[in-house]
Structure formats: C-alpha cells, structure tokens
C-alpha cells in the first residue's frame, strides 16, 4: 500500500488552531513537475457534505512530502469530508478523513467502519441533543433510511446493513429531520472486496494474518498497519510518537500523538494513534489495553508488562505477542519483512534462527506461496545463530506473495512470513524522441512510457548507422536529462533504441522499439560576397553576388537573401533555389526604406556564413499619375500627347517619363524623359507611318510615380520607315531614355 497518512489535529477549543496534514513516505512524493512523482493534494470535498462558504483554506507545502491545510475560522468549517491524494500512476491513492461536529445532535460511536464483503455493518449514532422528530439516514448524500425518534435503543439510532458489498462503501449520515446538516453524525463505511482473510481478483488468496489491528488489503494482500506499527504483518511496534510504514515520521508537538486522528489508505480508514482513544484521541489507554484506539488487549504472560504503545514487554527468557514463547523455543531472527527481486533472477535468500537446541541446516526451510518447500544449500553456524542460505529457482510472477521461513527443533518451532515482490524489468513502449539534429550530432529525449515496474535506475541509449551490422554504440544517461549523440556521420540514418533498468540484479529490461534518426547535411562553409546592386524602381532591387572558387563540387542547394528593415524591425527573406544563381530581383520592397542586405549559402536546412552586409536605400515612392492623358496623330511620324498635372503633389515635379510601345510588339518599351515639368503636352517624333502605338506616362519627384492610363493612337499615311521615336516639347528636342 502507498505510505500516505492524513493527520487531523483534534484540539478543538479553537478552530483556528485546527489543521490537517498529509504526509507521504513514498520516494519522490509530491515533486510535482517531476515526471516521476505527481504532487500531494489535500482538499475539502464538498460533494456530499456541503457547508456554508467561508474564507478559502490555506495550503502550505513543507518539503516534497508534506502538505498542511489551515485557515479554519469557525467550527462549521471543520465539519465534512477531507481527502489527501498521493502516489504516482497506478499507485495513486486517496485517503479520506470525516470530521464530526462535537456539538452535533447525533454523534457516531465509531466513525470508520471497515467490514468484509458479505458482513453485516452496524452504524450507531448516539443521541447528544434529543429532538422528537424522525431520524434520516443518508448514503453519499442521498436518502437511505428513516427511523422514528422512538426507535432509539439505549440512546442510539442503529442502521443495520446486512450482507454488504463494495458498492455500499461511502459516507453515511444520520440527521434529525429539520436539523442542520452540520448537526449530523457522519460515518465512513469501507467494504473490503473480499470475505474475511482473503484477497486477490477472485478472493482466492489468503491474507498474511495482519497483527495489532492491521487490515489486509483486498487488492495486493498487504497489511495496512495501524499508526505506530510496522512490518509485513504489523508485528513490530514503533517507538512512542512515531508512525509511517517504516516508523519514519514523528508526531508533532510535545504531547506526541495525543489529540491526533490518523487516516490511512483503505481499507484501514481512520483511528487514534497507538496508545490513545476517545472521540478526540485525548484519552490514554486503560490498563491492559494498547494500540490504535486502545482496541488491543495485552494479556501478557510469564511476567510481561503491558505498554500502551507496543503491547507486552517480555522479561528476559521470553518472547512472543503475549510473552508466551520461551527463549529455548527456536526463533527466527532479523528477517526482513519485505524483499524485492527482478523477474527471472535466481536470488539467494538467507534465514537466521537461534534456540536451544541449536538449529542446524536441515531444521530451517523456506516455503513459497504455492506451497513448494526449499531446503537450504548451505548454512553458516555462529555462536549465537545459524544462517541458512537458500538458492531460489528462476523467479516467475506467481512467486510474488508471502513466503515463510520455518525453523523446527525439539524445543519447538517458529516461523516468519515475509513478502516477496517479483518486479518486471521495465520495457519502453515507445521509441526515443528526436529533439534537434546537426550534421554530426543528434539530441534525443530518452524518457518514454514503459511497461513493467519502476523506479528507473538507468537508461541506456543504443545506436548505430541504419542497415549496419557493426556493434551497437551504447551511452548510459540520467533518466531525466536529454542526451547528445556525438561524432556521427553527416546525412546518415541512425537506428536508436532505449533500454531501461530498475534496481537490483537482473533489472535490465528488453530494448524498446527502434526509431530512425537522420543527421543533417554538412554545413555549407563558403561565404559569398555582394558584388553589387541597383534600384530598378521604388520597390525593386537587383542584387548580384559571387562565391570564392574552391576545388570539388559546391556544397549547397541555393542562396538565402536577407533584407533587414531596422526602422520597422522586419526581416524579408528571399530564397534562390539554384546554387548556380548569382543574381536575383527583389520586388515588393518598401519605397524610401533603408535596408541592410546580406546573402548566405544553404544546404538542406543548414545555413553557411553570411556575406558582409551592404546598406541599400530605396528611393521613396513617387507622385500620383498624370491625369487625362490623350494622344493625337499629327502626321505619318508624329503623335502629340496632352495631359493634366497629377493632383495632391507632395512636392515639385522634376520630370515626366513617357513610355512608348508598338501595339502588339514584342520588343521592350522606350522611355522618353520630359524635362520641363511645367509642360502639359509633348510631340513624339520619328514614329513609323500607319503604326499603332501605346503610350503611358508618369511623373517623378524624388522617385518615379504611378503610371497613367494607357492610350492608343496610330500615325498617319504611308511614309518612310522612321529611325525611332523622339519627343519634342515646344520645339525642344529630347534624348531617348532607354
């Protein structure tokens, strides 16, 4: 069972001093973010017992294995159900505490009732403040039964539950009709899944015979020991004031465990600590009684004295629960209460015994859960004891359970049961995960889900090139850290597998499924440099670059051009997918922007060194388009263009640019500058006769503006072929801007 204890401080004179503490003795309990241990949870459960809302309770964590709930302001805050959840995975366990108001109309004679399947449970509510109304019994908050107030027997209302089954488990309450729910008597019924003394899926297995009030768990056959007792069968008492599965915890405060209620995993429930009893666990045991709730009687023989915490303290020469065994009777010594081995191992188990006559090798035997008896292979005889060594055959899962070491001499016999846990070495259910890759290394997360048993002590990563017959390389790593596989070959597939181990001999599990991880290409090493660039418009830039000449093939798939706009904090990336390219046209840039430009070679996903950066200023965007452009043929070689100036100009126009193109022609258009910006007409000369032309124009301030609409016009007649169009504005000849 999970080592989880919920402590309730019942010194109830002041609710503000009341606290609940949940303590876990589990390894790694409550580490939270750690994948191997979820946190302890401690909370009030308002689903069944609803109380008026109050200020929120305060939760304080003390280290990794303890959590405390405080902040109760009034007695009604305390009434109800509290739960603590701890343990990981399949071992996650809920411990429940039910708190009754000391001033309630009805009080439970006993809060926790643990019964076996098929038993009759009797819940008894004692009348504390009488009301002459019906008594309503509820189960998990719903109506269950009713009694007339006359039906009280000796001042108690009894609820008999015959032939109880596990679904009958839960919170029961007895309430006077019309009384506040806080005045109810609250009970917790725990019904074990098996009949008395049995456990397991079909209740076929026999419980170990838990001592000192321990309760046999119906799932795993372990004894859940009362607070203050330990051992496989709860046979050992802890020192006064200690609790926990290994007596490792100490009760807080100077008065030890007085005034504390202890709640343990089902099917135990709750009780006072060893040596204490009463509704508030403040009364010491009466003479002759001991243990949790003082439920046990000493009945010491042969001069033994009764200690209320541990039971009979035997005089020299006697031992046993009631000091009934003479020291002449053989006695098993220092037998561990629990042993753990890995599946398919062949462990050695030692069993030591003393007595008079002295035990010899043949008088000590080991009995497995299936009844098989093993005889010792050798014995070590010392003055005060004989230690028999047993070689156990290869362990199987069915060997899990209670083993027994037995010694028999003419002086009598003794036996000691101990639990053997056969653990299954862990096997990964999934392949490791690739986190990042480079040309010569892979970063891998080895932490995967697994079948079998933890804890994980070591993780081995096995790897080798895919389709290789060479030996696997192995690296041993910490379970919680990522692993870097180094010195690998570039652009190579590697088969990678995880192997997990748990503590102990034979704890190595089988290898997990393989996964293919491929290293990256070699990094490109050549650094390009920018040869030059020129602006082809307010938003277009032509860039050219070079690479150093090196022998051998070029390691690269293409180039990445980067433009950094520092003002806006934006980066533009242009991919040139040919490694032979040495020029690129960048379009859609922002006019008037200062860019930092560089180029780098790439190979697969890897980038080579960037070129030294260049700084480029794009001209700002130009003015709006000229309006109402119109073309009129004047002769067989002349066409006149007229237009209106653009509206909303940001500044004075420096020139106009006219574009001339033969309609349907395949050649490049001609650009002609009009350097007199005040003009609104110009004559284009040198055109071919009877030819259809397309015209459009734009203005320039600091940069070229938007194009006007396109107009069409044909020259007249059938004259000679002209040399090419020229422009005249008020008889002034202009050069041709191509």
């Amino acid at each position: 069972a999970v080592d989880l204890t919920l402590l309730a401080n019942l010194r109830l004179t002041d609710p503000q001093r009341f606290f609940l503490t949940c303590v876990s003795g589990e390894a790694g309990a409550g580490r939270g973010s750690d994948a191997w241990g979820p946190p302890l949870l401690l909370e009030k459960d308002d689903r069944i017992v609803r109380t008026p809302p109050g200020p929120p309770l305060r939760l304080a964590r003390n280290g990794s294995h303890q959590v405390t709930l405080r902040g109760f302001s009034k007695p009604s805050d305390l009434v109800g159900v509290f739960s603590c959840v701890g343990g990981a995975g399949a071992r996650r366990t809920r411990v429940i505490y039910v708190h009754n108001s000391p001033g309630a109309h009805l009080l439970p004679d006993k809060v926790t009732h643990t019964v076996n399947k098929g038993d009759t449970a009797v819940l008894s509510a004692r009348v504390h403040k009488e009301k002459q109304t019906d008594v309503i019994w509820k189960s998990n908050g719903s109506y269950f039964y009713t009694l007339d107030w006359h039906e009280a027997q000796d001042g108690r209302f009894l609820l008999q539950l015959p032939n109880v089954q596990p679904p009958s488990s839960g919170i029961y309450s007895a309430t006077y009709l019309e009384a506040s729910p806080l005045g109810s008597a609250f009970f917790r019924l725990i019904v074990r899944g098996c009949g008395a003394g049995r456990w397991g899926p079909g209740c076929t297995k026999e419980c170990p015979g838990c001592l000192h009030g321990g309760v046999c768990h119906d799932h795993d056959g372990e004894c859940v020991c009362p607070p203050g007792f330990t051992g496989t069968r709860c046979e050992q008492a802890c020192r006064e004031g200690r609790f926990g599965q290994s007596c490792q915890e100490q009760c807080p405060g100077i008065s030890g465990c007085r005034g504390l209620t202890f709640c343990l995993p089902d099917p135990y429930g709750c009780s006072c600590g060893s040596g204490w009893r009463g509704s508030q666990c403040q009364e010491a045991c009466a003479p002759g009684h001991f243990g949790a709730d003082c439920r046990l009687q000493c009945q010491c023989q042969n001069g033994g004295t009764c200690d209320r915490f541990s039971g009979c303290v035997c005089p020299s020469g006697w031992h046993g629960v009631h000091c009934e065994k003479s020291d002449r009777i053989p006695q098993i010594l220092n037998m561990a209460s629990e042993l753990e081995f890995n599946l398919e191992t062949m462990p050695r188990i030692n069993c030591a015994a003393a007595g008079n006559p002295f035990p010899v090798r043949g008088s000590i035997e080991l009995r497995k859960p299936d009844g098989t008896v093993l005889l010792s292979t050798k014995a070590i005889v010392e003055p005060e004891k004989t230690t028999a060594e047993f070689e156990v055959p290869r362990l199987v899962l069915a060997d899990s359970g209670f083993w027994e070491c037995r010694v028999s001499t003419s002086g009598g016999q003794d036996s000691r049961r101990f639990k053997v846990n056969v653990k299954v070495p862990p096997v990964p259910l999934a392949a490791p995960r690739l986190l990042t890759k480079q040309s010569r290394q892979l970063v891998v997360s080895p932490l995967v889900s697994f079948s079998g048993d933890g804890p994980i002590s070591t993780v081995r990563l096995h790897y080798r090139p895919q389709d290789s017959t060479m030996d696997w390389s192995t690296i041993v790593v910490d379970p919680s850290e990522n692993v870097t596989l180094m010195n690998l070959r570039p652009k190579t597939g590697y088969s990678v597998r995880v192997q997990l181990s748990r503590p102990g001999e034979g704890g190595e599990g089988a290898w997990g499924p393989p996964t293919l991880m491929t290293t990256d290409c070699p990094e490109p090493l050549l650094q390009p440099w920018l040869e030059g660039w020129h602006v082809e418009g307010t938003d277009r830039l032509r860039v050219s670059w070079s690479l150093p000449l090196v022998p051998g093939p070029l390691v690269g798939d293409g180039f990445l051009l980067r433009l950094w706009d520092g003002t806006r904090g934006q980066e533009r990336r242009e991919n040139v997918s040919s490694p032979q390219a040495r020029t690129a046209l960048l379009t859609g840039l922002t006019p008037g922007t200062h860019y930092q430009l560089d180029v780098q070679l790439y190979h697969c996903t890897l980038l080579g060194p960037a070129s030294p950066p260049a700084h480029v200023l794009l001209p700002p965007s130009g003015p709006p388009a000229p309006r109402h452009l119109h073309a009129q043929a004047l002769s067989d070689s002349e066409i006149q263009l007229t237009w209106k100036h653009p509206e909303a100009l940001p500044g004075p126009i420096s020139k106009y640019v006219v574009e001339v193109q033969v309609a349907g022609g395949a050649g490049d258009p001609l650009w002609i500058d009009v350097d007199r910006p005040e003009e609104t007409s110009t004559i284009i000369r040198g055109l071919n006769a009877s030819t259809r032309y397309l015209f459009r124009m734009r203005a320039s301030i600091q940069g070229l503006g938007d194009w006007s609409n396109t107009v069409e016009e044909s020259t007249l007649g059938n004259g000679l072929q002209a040399e090419g169009p020229v422009q005249e504005s008020r008889a002034a000849e202009e050069g041709l801007d191509q």
Epitope: I136, S142, T146, L147, D148, E151, L177, E178
Partner: antibody, heavy 123, light 107 residues
Framework: EVQLLESGGGLVQPGGSLRLSCAAS????????MVWVRQAPGKGLEWVSV????????RYADSVKGRFTISRDNSKNTLYLQMNSLRAEDTAVYYC????????????????WGRGTLVTVSS | DIQMTQSPSSLSASVGDRVTITCRAS??????LNWYQQKPGRAPSLLIY???NLRSGVPSRFSGSGYGTDFTLTISGLQPEDFATYYC?????????FGQGTRVEIK
C-alpha cells in the same frame, strides 16, 4: 419499473375482517416509510396509518385505532393492512403510498401511489 | 390534529386562465405542505412538495408558495389536462392530514 399494487379489497359485512396487501417493486422497499390512505366514494383523501422501514414503529388515525393493524414483510417487499371490526364508514378505495423525503428539502411527501383497492362494508 | 381547509371547493375556468387555490392550516406548519392532483378513477399524484418544490416531470406552469398557515397553488395557464381535483396535505406532524379538495372544472 417503480410501482405499488394493492390487492385484497372486496365486499365485507359490518363487523367483519379483511386483509389488504401492497406489493412493491423497482425500489428498496425495506428502506422506506409506507402509508395507507383511503378515499370514501365522492369524498376527499384520509390518511390511515404509517409504518417505519424497520416495522418497529407504527401510527394510526384516531378513526381506525384499535381496529386496524399495519405491518410489512421486507423480505417479500409487501405492506399489509389488517382491518377488523369493519364499519360502513370504512367503505373506501384504499391506497398504499411511499413516504419520501428529498435530499435537500427536509419535508416528507407521498411520492409513489398504488392504483387502489375498493373495500365495501355493507350488509 | 392539524386541520387543513381549502378554498374554493370548486371553480370553473377556461383553458389559458390563471387559477389560484388556497390552503389554510389550523396551526403553523412552517413549509411542510404538499399538493396533489387527482383525476377521476385514478390515484392521486404528487405535484409540489415542501411548499414550492416542483416534482420532476411536472410542468412549470404549476407553482406553490406560502409559509406558516397560508399556502397557494397557482396554475399560470390552464391546460385541458389540468381539469382535476387538487388536494393540499401537511407533513409537519402526525397524523398527516389533507384538505377537502378543490375541483377545477371546464367553464
């Protein structure tokens, strides 16, 4: 299906006896208070008797006290009403009903009724 | 014993009408009053329990109110299936007692 079914009614002479039965099904009969309620022809409803789940506590209307006995057999899921010294004014349809209490609201009410059985006391 | 008095003993109403039936207890019964509906030849059935709690499956046009000695059953929009006899009943103490009933008829 949750239901109650009365039987045992009929014609009886004044001073005679009759035993009514009420068979319960579809719920845990042994957990509930059960009552008998009667209704004379053309009249209103009159509560007759109650028995608690254990069978250990009963109550009666003054008009039937000493003549009628309510009982139950939880193993058979059956409620009974033994009627002795019958009078003409006992003529009525007799209903058995379950007395229930809500989890939140603390008042008793008759939430489940049988169809009734007619008892006629006449010479 | 606690006496329960209903009024009116009968009333005629049309479909869609708002109908109110009152019930008076001879002593304080807190909120412990229930209402039942009975149709001819049928057993009574629970409508409202403990003053104002609507039984599951009962239409929301039925509502209950009141406290102490005076209680009301209201049908907000009478439907054809609502023509029946209605009884109040106290569950404050034993013996349980019913009102004499109110018959709701079609006008």
């Amino acid at each position: 299906e949750v239901q109650l079914l009365e039987s045992g009614g009929g014609l009886v002479q004044p001073g005679g006896s009759l035993r009514l039965s009420c068979a319960a099904s579809g719920f845990t009969f042994s957990h509930y208070k059960m009552v008998w309620v009667r209704q004379a022809p053309g009249k209103g409803l009159e509560w007759v008797s109650v028995i608690y789940p254990s069978g250990g506590w009963t109550r009666y209307a003054d008009s039937v006290k000493g003549r009628f006995t309510i009982s139950r057999d939880n193993s058979k899921n059956t409620l009974y009403l033994q009627m002795n010294s019958l009078r003409a004014e006992d003529t009525a349809v007799y209903y058995c009903a379950r007395e229930m209490i809500d989890t939140i609201s603390p008042g008793w009410h008759f939430d489940l009724w049988g169809r009734g059985t007619l008892v006629t006391v006449s010479s | 014993d606690i006496q329960m008095t209903q009024s009116p003993s009968s009333l005629s109403a049309s479909v869609g009408d708002r109908v109110t039936i009152t019930c008076r207890a001879s002593q304080n019964i807190n909120i412990y009053l229930n209402w039942y509906q009975q149709k001819p030849g049928r057993a009574p059935s629970l409508l409202i329990y403990t003053q104002s709690n609507l039984r599951s499956g009962v239409p929301s046009r039925f509502s209950g109110s009141g406290y102490g000695t005076d209680f009301t059953l209201t049908i907000s929009g009478l439907q054809p299936e609502d023509f029946a006899t209605y009884y109040c009943q106290q569950s404050h103490s034993a013996p349980r007692t019913f009102g004499q009933g109110t018959r709701v008829e079609i006008k």
